[in-house]
């Protein structure tokens, strides 16, 4: 986890201001509206899980 303004989150993760921590971009498949998903590299749309 990173503090904002310091080194970026590790590959495959992005900073969430709401949760105050780096979060996994992979979780954007299930929760695409999470704030940190804006910072994740665009990927082809995946099947959306229930």
């Amino acid at each position: 986890e990173q503090a904002p303004g310091t080194a970026p989150c590790s590959r495959g993760s992005s900073w969430s201001a709401a949760l105050d921590k780096c979060m996994d971009c992979a979780s954007c498949r299930a929760r695409p509206h999470s704030d940190f998903c804006l910072g994740c590299a665009a990927a082809p749309p995946a099947p959306f899980r229930l």
Epitope: L19, D24, S27, A30, R31, P44
Partner: antibody
Framework: QVQLQQSGGGLVQPGGSMKLSCIAS????????MSWVRQSPEKGLEWVAE??????????HYAESVKGKFTISRDDSKSRFFLQMNNLRAEDTGIYYC??????????WGQGTDLTVSS | DIVMTQTPASLAVSLGQRATISCRAS??????????MHWYQQKPGQPPKLLIK???SLESGVPARFSGSGSGTDFTLNIHPVEEDDTATYYC?????????FGGGTKLEIK
């Protein structure tokens, strides 16, 4: 420090009811999805139920084996969630764990509580 | 439901050697970008502990002796070099869809 503290469990007769509780601390509870996972020698680790966050309309999902019998709920104001179990049968016997997930993996776990369904 | 098949059910590995545990899903649990497969370690009397998320991403605080690989339907957990403290049961779990399901577990013994 993240903690999930469980209560409830014990011995219940077949056809009886039991309510399990889990109180969370040390993380942003309201943003996380919460699940119950049970474990038995016969079935191993088995996901039971999930309740999502307010932003996901508190959607609930259940394993087929407990649909209509178990009800999951949460109280974000007190960082706690519950599993109401009705019409219990011997096959519901096991260790029940509460767990949190942002979306995919079970990150934090409670200590587990034993449920025995027997006459 | 997606069935997770773990092999072997148990294994004994000499201290300092490599332990390899396999998990096969009954259908693909991967996109072109990520695999929705996770690994846990469980010791007697304790809840499972997350080791690897998304097939290969090491959870914070987990020693680099643990590594995960695979995509699609076939995944592997490697532990090298194994230490005495690694005696435990290891489980895989997918999050591709509901219901989430776990493998049957692999009991690791250190010789």
């Amino acid at each position: 420090q993240v903690q999930l503290q469980q209560s409830g469990g014990g011995l219940v007769q077949p056809g009886g009811s039991m309510k399990l509780s889990c109180i969370a601390s040390g993380f942003t509870f309201s943003s996380y999805w919460m699940s119950w996972v049970r474990q038995s020698p016969e079935k191993g680790l088995e996901w039971v139920a999930e309740i999502r966050s307010k932003s996901d309309n508190y959607a609930t999902h259940y394993a087929e084996s407990v649909k209509g019998k178990f009800t999951i709920s949460r109280d974000d104001s007190k960082s706690r969630f519950f599993l109401q179990m009705n019409n219990l049968r011997a096959e519901d016997t096991g260790i029940y764990y509460c767990s949190s997930t942002y979306a995919d993996y079970f990150h934090y776990w409670g200590q587990g509580t034993d449920l025995t369904v027997s006459s | 439901d997606i069935v997770m098949t773990q092999t072997p059910a148990s294994l004994a590995v000499s201290l300092g050697q490599r332990a390899t545990i396999s998990c096969r899903a009954s259908q693909s649990v991967s996109t072109s970008t990520y695999s929705y497969m996770h690994w846990y370690q469980q010791k007697p009397g304790q809840p499972p502990k997350l080791l690897i998320k998304y097939a290969s991403s090491l959870e914070s605080g987990v020693p680099a002796r643990f590594s995960g690989s695979g995509s699609g339907t076939d995944f592997t957990l490697n532990i090298h070099p194994v230490e005495e403290d690694d005696t435990a049961t290891y489980y895989c779990q997918h999050s591709w869809e509901i219901p989430y399901t776990f493998g049957g577990g692999t009991k690791l013994e250190i010789k």
